[in-house]
């Protein structure tokens, strides 16, 4: 019953970490840019995704426009843009395992290989955990960077965005997932062996009568 | 429909004061800075000065060439922008716009008012 | 304070394509973001924003205008020009304090 628990919890994580990875890459927040000038006109944040780019003035409009093309995304955002879309795929891939390869559903038959399954989608959410979590920390690390280099404008220093605090927590959601999958171990296969015990147990019996 | 009536205009001596007004209508006004620019007779356009909404703590800006001299305020209450210009000098001839702030620039504007300072 | 440099006129044939272009001093541009800003000015009548962000047309204004560039090179295009064009066009940056204006160009039909 613990197991039971155990691998509900571990999906229930792991689903919640697909979630909020989808809400990462839809969230036009990977990097933030404030103007706060000394004139309302020109204070202004900029809001950058892996899909479209904000304009939030100080007088509280927003304007967001999608990108041009994939051209108009710096390198850097057109690699998070792949390898969050394929951990998205991987983690709906994960999802999918875990309702096949679950106790309470009747997909598989055979115990250990509903087991197996199990942990192979547990491998898979950990995957995808490792997926969001470097680009996130690649952006991260390329924010710091810039914000330390004296090279670098004061203007044109990027602070981190809400969707990196997200994509790692859902890193951290689907790599806890994925673990707790995977320490769902299979059955062992000793029935055979407590039958055949059994047997001996009560042949023995009635030779003894 | 966004429209501006600027009022007040006039013509005004060296160092003498004047004190422009813009009554606004058609817009939520108590949300959106506004801002004064002027156009000298046959030149172009100068942000002159500007007033955030309350949201941003009323915080105001002005141009180099009018600190110190000019002052904008705003009343919500009767969606009424004010420019209070003291010291005028003949630099300061021109027409006066109105405008409301929008996408980083100025979305509406009223028909402007003219300001001579002349001896 | 960034210096937007405009050509004092340009003369276009109705049904033509009109360009106008705008230099910045510096660049108007932060991540893919063009902090520019175009506005019509007829004779005798205030200025109308025509474009906000480099390229996006403000409500009300027709087709026949569009906006387009980045860094310190930005250029509106009227196509086809009709004869109502007839006005002082300005770009104005917001990528630092102060905003400032181009000096204006002012189109003519031939």
């Known amino acids: 019953m613990a197991s039971m628990g155990l691998q509900v919890m571990g999906i229930a994580l792991a689903v919640l970490g697909w979630l909020a990875v989808m809400l990462c890459c839809a969230l036009p927040m990977w990097r933030v840019t404030a103007f706060i000038g000394s004139n309302i006109v020109t204070s202004q944040t900029i809001w950058e995704g892996l899909w479209m780019n904000c304009v939030v003035q100080s007088t509280g409009q927003m304007q967001c426009k999608v990108y041009d093309s994939l051209l108009a995304l710096p390198q850097d955002l057109q690699a998070a843009r792949a390898l969050v879309i394929i951990s998205i795929i991987v983690a709906a891939l994960g999802v999918l395992l875990s309702v096949v390869g679950g106790k309470c559903t009747n997909c598989l038959e055979d115990e250990s290989a509903k087991a197996k399954t199990m942990i192979v989608a547990g491998v898979v959410f950990l995957l995808a955990g490792l997926m969001v979590i470097v680009p996130v920390s690649w952006t991260a690390h390329n924010i710091i960077q810039d914000f330390y280099n004296p090279l670098v404008a004061s203007g044109q220093k990027r602070e981190m965005g809400a969707s990196l605090y997200v994509g790692w927590a859902a890193s951290g959601l689907l790599l806890l997932g994925g673990g707790l999958l995977c320490c769902n171990c299979p059955p062992r296969t000793d029935k055979p062996y407590s039958a055949k015990y059994s047997a001996a147990r009560s042949a023995a019996a009635s030779n003894y009568v | 429909e966004v429209q501006l009536v600027e009022s007040g205009g006039g013509l005004v001596q060296p160092k003498g004061s004047l004190k422009l007004s813009c009554a606004a209508s058609?817009?939520?006004?108590?949300?959106?800075?506004m801002s004064w620019v002027r156009q000298a007779p046959g030149k172009g356009l100068d942000l002159v000065a500007d007033i955030s909404s309350k949201s941003y703590s009323y915080a105001t800006y002005y141009a180099d060439s009018v600190k110190d001299r000019f002052t904008i305020s705003r009343d919500d209450s009767q969606s009424m922008v004010y420019l209070q210009m003291d010291n005028l000098k003949t630099e300061d001839t021109a027409l006066y716009y109105c405008?409301?702030?929008?996408?980083?620039?100025?979305?509406?504007w009223g028909q402007g008012v003219m300001v001579t300072v002349s001896s | 304070d960034i210096v937007l440099t405009q050509s004092p006129a340009l003369a276009v044939s109705p049904g033509q394509r009109a360009t106008i272009s705008c230099r910045a001093s510096?660049?108007?541009?932060?991540?893919?973001?063009?902090?520019m800003n175009w506005y019509q000015q007829k004779p005798g009548q205030q200025p109308k924003l025509l474009i906000y962000?480099?390229?996006n047309l403000d409500s009300g204004i027709p087709t026949r205008f569009s906006g387009s560039g980045s860094g310190t090179d930005f250029t509106l295009t009227i196509d086809p020009v009709q004869a109502d064009d007839i006005a002082t066009y300005y770009c104005?940056?917001?990528?630092?304090?102060?905003?400032?204006f181009g000096s204006g160009t002012k189109l003519e039909i031939k």
């Open positions: 510096q660049s108007v541009s932060i991540s893919s973001v063009n902090l």
């Open positions: 058609g817009f939520d006004f108590n949300s959106y800075g």
């Open positions: 962000h480099a390229s």
């Open positions: 405008a409301m702030i929008l996408y980083g620039g100025f979305g509406g």
């Open positions: 104005q940056h917001s990528r630092e304090s102060p905003p400032t």
